[in-house]
Amino acid sequence: SLLPVPYTEAASLSTGSTVTIKGRPLACFLNEPYLQVDFHTEMKEESDIVFHFQVCFGRRVVMNSREYGAWKQQVESKNMPFQDGQEFELSISVLPDKYQVMVNGQSSYTFDHRIKPEAVKMVQVWRDISLTKFNVSYLKR
Amino acid sequence: SLLPVPYTEAASLSTGSTVTIKGRPLACFLNEPYLQVDFHTEMKEESDIVFHFQVCFGRRVVMNSREYGAWKQQVESKNMPFQDGQEFELSISVLPDKYQVMVNGQSSYTFDHRIKPEAVKMVQVWRDISLTKFNVSYLKR
C-alpha cells in the first residue's frame, strides 16, 4: 500500500544509521518528475536542512544544505542510475564523514557532512513519486 | 474531496474555452513546491505540449511548448500572485491569439499561441499541490 506524499517522519541519525526509501516516479522521464529527500533540523518543514537530495529524473541530482534559512553551495551530479518508469530503492547511509546514497544497491552519490548528522530530527520525502516503503534503521549499540 | 494528482483529463479547446483549477501548495514556499499544468496533443503523457505552465511557488513561473519532443524557448515571469499556504484558483482562458492565466481573479500571465489550441487533447495538472477542482468550460456555440 502507498504511503502519503509528502511523507514526514521523526528521525534521529548518527554514524551507522540508514534511511531506506522505495518508490516510483509518477511521470515519464521526458516530463522530468522530481524526487526530494530532506533531512531537517526540526519537525517543522521550514526548518534548516542538513542534507537536501533532489533528483530530477533523467537529468541530474543536486545535493545541498540549508543553514539559517539560506541555501549553501550546491553539489551536482549527472549520474542517473534511476530507470524510466521503474521502481527504485534508495538507501542513504550515514558514514563517519559523509552520506552515501545507494540506488538499487549501487553506490551512486556521496555528500560530505556539513552539519552533524545528530542534528537531524525529521526526514521528509516528497515531490513526484509514489512511496511504498520508508524505514530508518539504527546502529545497534 | 481531493482529486488524484497527477490529474489527467481529456479536453478539446478552442477560443472561448476556460480551464479552471482549484488547489493548494503541499509545502511552504521556502521549500519551493511546484505546480504544473500541461496541455497535451495526445492522451499520452509523453506527447507534445501545446502549453506548459509551471509555477515554482514563491520564485517564478515558466511557460513553454514542447514540439516533436523538444522544448522550445521558455518564457519566464517573476510575477507571484500565489500566497504561501493559501488555496488558489487558476483559470486559463483561450483567447484568439493567446492563453490568459488568471490567479484568484487577477490577470497574471499570458502566452501567445504557438500551436493551435484545437490541437489539445488532454490536460494534466501535477506536481506539489492538492487539487480540489478541475473544470473545462466550453464556449456555447
Epitope: 533540523t41 544544505s65 543553514e67 539559517y68 539560506a70 549553501k72 553551495q73 553539489v75 564523514d97 560530505d112 557532512h113 556539513r114 552539519i115 552533524k116 545528530e118 542534528a119 | -
Partner: antibody, heavy 123, light 107 residues
Framework: ELQLVESGGGLVQPGGSLRLSCSAS????????MNWVRQAPGKGLEWVSG????????SYGESVKGRFTISRDNAKNTLYLQMNRLNPDDTAVYYC????????????????WGQGTQVTVSS | SSALTQPSAVSVSLGQTARITCQGG??????VSWYQQKPGQAPVLVIY???ERPSGIPERFSGSSSGDTATLTISGAQAEDEADYYC??????????FGGGTHLTVL
Amino acid sequence: ELQLVESGGGLVQPGGSLRLSCSASGFTFGAYAMNWVRQAPGKGLEWVSGVNSGGGLTSYGESVKGRFTISRDNAKNTLYLQMNRLNPDDTAVYYCAKSKRGAVVAGTGDDYWGQGTQVTVSS
Amino acid sequence: SSALTQPSAVSVSLGQTARITCQGGNFGRYYVSWYQQKPGQAPVLVIYKDSERPSGIPERFSGSSSGDTATLTISGAQAEDEADYYCQSGSSSDNAVFGGGTHLTVL
C-alpha cells in the same frame, strides 16, 4: 614527507595586490580541501578562505569577501590566494593548511600547516 | 570580536587537569576542532570533529561539546603543553571561525 611551502608575501602599499602560492608535496593534493588562515602580529588566528578538493566550491571570511580569490591547480599541486585592494588590516602571517577532508567544513580539522609567509600592507 | 569566546589565560599545575572552554558556538550543529600553537611556530591540530585525536597527539588531550560550549581537556598537563590554544567551529558549515585563543601556563 608531507610539506606545504607558502610564497609570494612581501611589502605592498594600501590598495595594492599580491598573489600568494602554496606548494604541496608528499600527499595526494587533489584529494583534500585546502584553507588559508592568517595571524596578525600578536593576535589570534583568523580563517581567510577555503576551497574543496576539486576547486569548484570556495568560501571566504567576511573581512576578505569580494577582495580575495582562492584557487588551486591540482596538476601543479599548488594553492593560490589572489589578494586585491589590500589594506593595513590585512597585515599578517598567511598560512596554508591541508584539511583532513575533501570538503570545506568548519571544525573538521586542518592537519598540516605551512610555516607561513609574511604580508605587510603599509605606505 | 570573535564569535567564539575563550578565556584569555588558564593556569594548571604540572600533572593536573586543564580545561579550556570555547563558548558561543552552535556545537549541536557544527563540529569543533582545537589547535595548539607555540611561539614562532605554525598551529598543530590536537582535536577535530569535537573529540577525535589525530595520530601522534598524546592521549591526555581530549575534547567534548554540548550545546553552546566546547571543552578541551588536558589530563596530566606536561611542561611541553604550555602554548596558545584555539578552538575553531562554524558560523555556517562553510564559514570557519576561530576563538580568540587561550594561553595555557603549566606551573
